[in-house]
Interface confidence: medium
């Protein structure tokens, strides 16, 4: 081409302005409203309406003129309610009376099917600490817990650890101020993500894996009940709930002496076909490197806040970025993949199955995941959970984007990073980070209190617009946050991942570990090697920064080699010493299992607080493997094998 024909170079300020102007003319509420019309609601995973919406999204992607649009089919097992209703009853100890409390409208997927009878004990939110603080032992008893604070799966796992025989979950009016006390709700109890019957491997139709079962499935029955049902149970219980629980005055602690509660759950397994829909805008320089932007499509109830907002953001961002590329001269270096997942309600099943299908290669290609789920749950606060690799990007974006109502910058607290909450099991970004080692971010505009209607039949567009009258403005701000992430990640020559941020994470871990140096010495162990590994990691990051500074930004080959080193950082924090099948969430910082740094610290604490539960051999293993994982990350970041100091 002649120089005259060259596309003018677009800079960050040009692209930021372009994005902002396009979003100003986007009608998000109409799209959200459309996604909540009768033809798409309710859309439980695998249902006809879920498939209808999948087709619609696929067509929209095609109309956006994305470079390529495709779909993945998975065959997964979910649990649905049986025609025989689940029930909660109160009986006399000698069965002299039986009183039906409720046949609940909702249910908890992946509950154990069983009928259990026993006394009922209130365990607040069902956190580990809540169980520790209880006066009444729960072994052999059912427990009733409030929704909120932690996932249903964690509540059930904690109850099971305390030897409870069943779990009831309700929404108290204090935390969930819903007028209608009979509202039913839904959740799942799989302490993990993906299809729990194909743990660690994908559920494509042609993959003949032997029967298997996730260790994160519960072995006790669990059921959601309405607030009205909980109040009927409380009428048959005694002992006021502690005032520091800050719950309803009707709350009671334990069933009366002569009464028992019976829980009967008979859900059924169902194999369903789910569709993940994808579209891509191909990068102009490195099309094989991509940022993935995803949203859950399915929903047990109407799912306005849970899945319609995220899906609307996905569709509008696809349209916006396609226009920027096709009409306005934006030439992203790297690709952008738009993904609509199904079966999110059952534990990020669609997203995880995709990750499992490409486990060996995805971390070499996908360098960031941006989750759009539940991005708008309120107006007051902007909250974010992410890999530390993305903190610098997030901070820059917060400084650039204005709050949709106050007009002030989203960056109001220089200490925001220390308040970031870990990604949890119920977030689609979690498996990207903890299972696949791909940096991931999830964010929301929200209130201090939970959005009360998630997972209920009241998660309608009507309630959403009533709770958030300025929905269009807030959705626009959410799109601008995601859009700026996307531009910065695909446009800049140097990959926008702050690999140096893990230095402070490692330092923080070592500080915590150092509190127990006396215990470590008593076991004849030393932290020298761990400090050495941390030092090597620090030196590797410094060297990489120097390499970037000294490199010619126009030398694509050199930049690609440096960027590839950055891309591997997150992945190398996945413990290579545990099996993805047995411990899928291998990340030593953000995963779950005994290989994590937090598990190592919790275990070491037991040496003082509960010595009988402390296992020195296990601890020695934990320390050695953590050290080697960190050392491995340092080595990977250093570059070629002949550059690595092997004195270690």
């Amino acid at each position: 081409k002649d120089d005259d024909d060259k596309v003018p170079q677009l800079y960050w300020d040009d692209l930021k302005k372009m994005l902002s102007e396009k979003l100003d003319t986007t009608d998000f509420t109409s799209t959200i409203k459309l996604l909540n019309e009768n033809s798409y609601v309710p859309r439980e995973a695998g249902s006809q309406k879920d498939e209808n919406l999948a087709w619609y999204i696929e067509n929209q992607f095609r109309e956006c003129k994305l470079s390529k649009v495709w779909r993945d089919e998975h065959f997964v097992k979910i649990q649905v309610k049986d025609s025989a209703q689940n029930s909660v009853t109160i009986t006399g100890t000698n069965s002299e009376f039986v009183y039906l409390v409720e046949n609940p409208g909702g249910y908890v997927a992946y509950s154990q099917n069983a009928t259990v009878t026993g006394k009922l004990v209130h365990a607040n939110f069902g956190t580990e600490k809540d169980f520790e603080d209880l006066d009444s032992p729960v072994n052999g008893s059912l427990v009733i817990v409030r929704a909120g604070k932690i996932t249903f799966a964690e509540k059930v796992a904690n109850a099971e650890s305390a030897n409870a025989i069943g779990v009831l979950i309700y929404m108290d009016k204090t935390k969930f101020p819903i007028v209608d006390a009979d509202v039913s709700f839904f959740g799942h109890a799989h302490l993990g993500t993906g299809d729990p019957y194909t743990p660690g491997f994908p559920s494509f139709n042609h993959t003949q894996f032997p029967p298997s079962r996730s260790s994160g499935l519960p072995n006790i029955p669990v059921q959601t009940i309405s607030r009205a049902a909980a109040e009927r149970l409380f009428e048959n219980m005694e002992g006021d709930c502690p005032s520091d629980w800050k719950t309803d005055s009707s709350c009671r602690m334990v069933t009366s002496q002569n009464k028992s509660v019976k829980l009967s759950v008979s859900n059924v397994m169902k194999e369903i076909k789910i569709l993940n829909i994808f579209g891509v805008i191909k990068g102009f320089v490195e099309p094989d490197r991509y940022v993935v932007v995803g949203a859950q499509r399915d929903s047990w109830g109407p799912g306005a806040a849970k899945s319609s907002v995220g899906t609307a953001l996905l569709l509008e961002l696809a349209q916006t970025f396609s226009d920027m590329v096709l009409k306005d001269g934006f030439q992203p270096s790297r690709s952008i993949v738009f993904a609509s997942w199904s079966a999110g309600d059952f534990g990020s099943v669609g997203a995880t199955e995709w990750l499992e299908g490409y486990l060996s290669s995805l971390h070499l290609k996908a360098f960031t995941f941006i989750n759009l789920d539940k991005a708008v749950l309120g107006t007051s606060n902007f909250r974010v959970s992410a890999s530390p690799l993305l903190y610098a990007l997030i901070e820059k974006t917060m400084q650039e984007v204005k709050h949709p109502v106050t007009g002030l910058s989203l960056y109001q607290d220089s200490n925001w990073a220390s308040k970031v909450e870990k990604l949890t099991f119920d977030n689609a970004a979690f498996p990207f980070l903890a299972y696949s080692g791909i940096p991931a971010v999830s964010f929301c505009f929200c209130e201090d209190t939970d959005y009360p209607y998630l997972g209920t039949t009241m998660d309608t567009y009507k309630e959403l617009i009533e709770k958030i009258p300025q929905l269009n403005k807030v959705a626009r701000a959410a799109a601008e946050v995601a859009g700026q992430f996307m531009i910065k990640l695909t446009h800049d020559v140097e990959l926008n991942l702050d690999y140096e941020r893990y230095n402070s994470q490692l330092l923080s871990f070592l500080r915590n570990l150092n509190q127990y140096r006396a215990d470590i010495r008593e076991m004849g162990l030393s932290l020298q090697w761990l400090y050495s590994a941390r030092g090597d990691f620090f030196r590797a990051t410094s060297r990489l920064t120097t390499d970037f500074k000294n490199s010619e930004k126009t030398d694509r080959f050199v930049m690609k080699e440096l960027n590839d080193r950055v891309m591997k950082v997150e992945y190398y924090f996945l413990s290579p010493y545990v099996s993805p099948r047995e411990s899928p969430f291998r990340h030593i910082f953000w995963g779950s299992g005994s290989h994590t740094l937090s598990a190592l610290l919790e275990h070491l604490k037991l040496r003082k607080t509960n010595n009988r539960a402390f296992n020195e051999t296990l601890f020695r293993n934990q320390l050695a493997l953590a050290t080697w994982t960190i050392q491995g990350a340092a080595n990977a970041l250093s570059g070629d094998i002949w550059d690595i100091d092997n004195e270690f």
């Epitope: 003319t25 986007t26 409203k33 929905l471 269009n472």
Partner: antibody, heavy 122, light 106 residues
């Protein structure tokens, strides 16, 4: 003070065209969706068309789809309704109405103009 | 297409409570609002989002919406409340008005 002033009404023959305008003042025009609502003599209210604050999204009643076009000029704070292929049943007072928020998403019409009469007759 | 139905007329004595209904399939799942229109005047919004009152509208006007019916209630009806009342909702991307109810204060 919010003001909406319609103009452009009058007598027109069946099959003819007419362009209604609504001049808005007293609020940030581009931040609000706008609508046209009509009322035939002695009859009830009938929604005709709506447009989002940016002008990117437009909607029409089935009875006027393909014949009427709604548009806005945010630099001039005006809302227009181009009416083609007019029929006798289009005879009505046409009101311009401001929506409470910038996007047509279950928001009420909090301000109305005084209306302009359109008569379609031969 | 979606329709909402109102009674053509309702009569009430001064000081009494007037109730005007608006019915439509699963109307409670949608928002309803109400407009008052006096002869020769433009409509005025009196209730929005089922039960909210714009500033300047007297407290005697209230609204509710559940099941298939939205209701506008005027307690302690005054002669000045005599007017046509229209309920309005949304279906898909269109705005739906009821046929209107003439409230007569006897």
């Amino acid at each position: 003070e919010v003001q909406l002033l319609e103009s452009g009404g009058g007598l027109v023959q069946p099959g003819g065209s007419l362009r209604l305008s609504c001049a808005a003042s007293g609020f940030t025009f581009s931040s609000y969706a706008m609508n046209w609502v009509r009322q035939a003599p002695g009859k009830g209210l009938e929604w005709v068309s709506g447009i989002s604050g940016s002008g990117v999204s437009t909607n029409y009643a089935d009875s006027v789809k393909g014949r009427f076009t709604i548009s806005r000029d945010n630099s001039k704070n005006t809302l227009d309704l181009q009416m083609n292929s007019l029929r006798a049943e289009d005879t009505a007072v046409y009101y311009c109405a401001k929506e409470d928020y910038d996007s047509s998403g279950y928001y009420p019409f909090d301000y109305w103009g005084q209306g302009t009469l359109v008569t379609v007759s031969s | 297409s979606y329709e909402v139905t109102q009674p053509p007329s309702v009569s009430v004595s001064p000081g009494q409570t007037a109730s005007i209904t608006c019915s439509g399939h699963k109307l409670g799942d949608k928002f309803a609002c109400w407009y008052q229109q006096k002869p020769g005047q433009s409509p005025v919004l009196v209730i929005y989002q089922d039960r909210k009152r714009p500033s300047g509208i007297p407290e005697r006007f209230s609204g509710s919406n559940s099941g298939n019916t939205a209701t506008l209630t005027i307690s302690g009806t005054q002669a000045m409340d005599e007017a046509d009342y229209y309920c309005q909702t949304w279906y898909s991307s269109t705005v739906i008005f009821g046929g209107g109810t003439k409230l007569t204060v006897l």
